[in-house]
């Protein structure tokens, strides 16, 4: 078969199952200071659907610090500030990537993470269910 | 400031400004099969802020494809399908990590890269600004 | 050295569902960046993308063919498969599977290639 | 999806000479993060396509030098300088910047 182009200076990986662990270049390209999404953006509170940001803080993890939504309400908020029952608030999700230590309190070895977090909610009409 | 806990397994560090470039095993955890988001929830069709799902593909970054969300609409949908323009559609985003090969042929070594994607939409009231 | 080898039925009648395997070596799907694409082309034309999927077992297809396209695999046997139900005489192609990784370029390998007709 | 075309659909050459290839896309295959994955295939009688050229114009490991790729946007050249015996089979054009990935229809370099 014909050889996989490869650098002189890339690491070496004749492991079979490589790369199992690989070198990650941590200084951040594209990066947007990431900070508390409140400062960013006030949508969570003009919402019909608004939300509450609560602080998952996790000193293993890369990144330390995200923010997962909460709906306020089961229901939507009408112009008046009333909650309707007849729709629902609920939360938009995303599988995002972090890096955990591994092992533990070792700084520069990880193991990435798929993790699931809410970023904020929307308002949506609900399934009814009819019974026969 | 605190110093890191060191276990004596870990990799040496000595770099003032580390960690540059770190280890990352990539057997990923907690992993949920990452499918198009149009199987795994059909609130971008049911929200008062509908959104389409537009594919971006890059085949040297992980993961590969990422799925944005495009607000359907301006203003909101009401309950008679008509849309509100009084009220505005907005996206949600979230800035997430990904990994992007560097150097481009060295099959074992990444950037970690922060991108900023909408994950969906949500209806707001929209700010009026008064002319005095 | 790696390899890929095609198998399949050969021949099958209209309505019928194709069953494709890919069988592979000197790689694994279990391995961070790796992934299989099927491509096929019928008799004297050209190629036409069909499939991929990667170790982590996200998948894609051709939306012109979606509906009727299944892929996964067996990481442990390294096997992929390619399900194509309702076969028509326009399906009647060689069927290939190509080996992809995460980065610059897609397919570096390909199999031989594994000729279907389908027939009444 | 994009439609790649590709001229001529036959192209008679002698041994030695100079060959040339077009593809043209149906619509700028410059990918959002300013690379073109566009790729040339070598598929010689009775066998299975082989990379020769990616992202345009970088020749894939083994792949002699007598070959190059060109081009930008939509359009794109392969080059073949001094053909040989085992440079005759069908040349497909590839782009996978945009979903679906799609093929030209392939040139034939035939012996003249």
């Known amino acids: 078969g014909i050889a996989i182009p490869r650098n002189s200076g890339c690491p070496n990986s004749e492991d079979k199952n490589f790369p199992r662990t690989v070198m990650v270049n941590l200084n951040i390209h594209n990066r947007n200071t990431s900070t508390n999404p409140k400062r960013s953006s006030d949508y969570y509170n003009r919402s019909t659907s608004p939300w509450n940001l609560h602080r998952n803080e996790d000193p293993e993890r890369y990144p330390s610090v995200i923010w997962e939504a909460k709906c306020r309400h089961l229901g939507c908020v009408k112009a008046d500030g009333n909650v309707d029952y007849h729709m629902n608030s609920v939360p938009i999700q995303q599988e995002i990537l972090v890096l955990r230590r591994e092992p533990r309190h070792c700084p520069n070895s990880f193991r990435l993470e798929k993790i699931l977090v809410s970023v904020g909610c929307t308002c949506v009409t609900p399934i009814v269910h009819h019974v026969a | 400031g605190i110093a890191i806990p060191r276990n004596s397994g870990c990799p040496n560090s000595e770099d003032k400004n580390f960690p540059r470039t770190v280890m990352v095993n990539l057997n990923i955890h907690n992993r949920n099969t990452s499918t198009n988001p149009k199987r795994s929830s059909d609130y971008y069709n049911r929200s008062t802020s509908p959104w389409n799902l537009h594919r971006n593909e890059d085949p040297e970054r992980y993961p590969s494809v990422i799925w944005e969300a495009k607000c359907r609409h301006l203003g909101c949908v009401k309950a008679d399908g008509n849309v509100d323009y009084h009220m505005n559609s907005v996206p949600i985003q979230q800035e997430i990590l990904v990994l992007r090969r560097e150097p481009r042929h060295c099959p074992n070594s990444f950037r970690l890269e922060k991108i900023l994607v909408s994950v969906g939409c949500t209806c707001v009231t929209p700010i009026v600004h008064h002319v005095a | 050295q790696v390899t890929l080898k095609e198998s399949g039925p050969g021949i099958l009648q209209p309505s019928q569902t194709l069953s494709l395997t890919c069988s592979f070596s000197?790689?694994?799907?279990?391995?961070?960046?790796?992934?299989v694409d099927w491509i096929r082309q019928p008799s004297g034309k050209g190629l036409e993308w069909l499939a991929h999927?990667?170790?982590?077992?996200?998948?894609y297809y051709n939306p012109a063919l979606e509906s009727r396209l299944t892929i996964s695999k067996d990481a442990s046997k390294n096997q992929v498969f390619l399900k194509i139900a309702n076969v028509d005489t326009a399906d009647t192609a060689t069927y290939y599977c190509?080996?992809?990784?995460?980065?610059?370029?897609?397919?570096?390998?390909w199999g031989q290639g594994t000729t279907l007709t389908v027939s009444s | 999806g994009v439609l790649m075309t590709q001229t001529p659909l036959s192209l008679p050459v002698s041994l030695g000479d100079q060959a040339s290839i077009s593809c043209r896309s149906s619509?700028?295959?410059?990918?959002?993060?300013?690379?073109?994955?566009l790729e040339w295939y070598l598929q010689k009688p009775g066998q299975s396509p082989k990379l020769l050229i990616y992202?345009?114009?970088n020749r894939f490991s083994g792949v002699p030098d007598r070959f190059s790729g060109s081009g930008s946007g939509t359009d794109f050249t392969l080059k073949i300088n001094r053909v040989e015996a085992e440079d005759l089979g069908v040349y497909y054009c590839?782009?996978?910047?945009?979903?679906?990935?799609?093929f030209g229809g392939g040139t034939k370099l035939e012996i003249d």
């Open positions: 590839f782009q996978g910047s945009h979903f679906p990935y799609t």
């Open positions: 000197g790689f694994s799907l279990n391995t961070f960046g790796m992934g």
């Open positions: 190509s080996r992809r990784e995460l980065g610059p370029y897609f397919f570096d390998y």
């Open positions: 992202k345009v114009s």
């Open positions: 619509q700028s295959i410059v990918h959002s993060n300013g690379n073109t994955y």
């Open positions: 999927i990667w170790w982590d077992d996200d998948k």
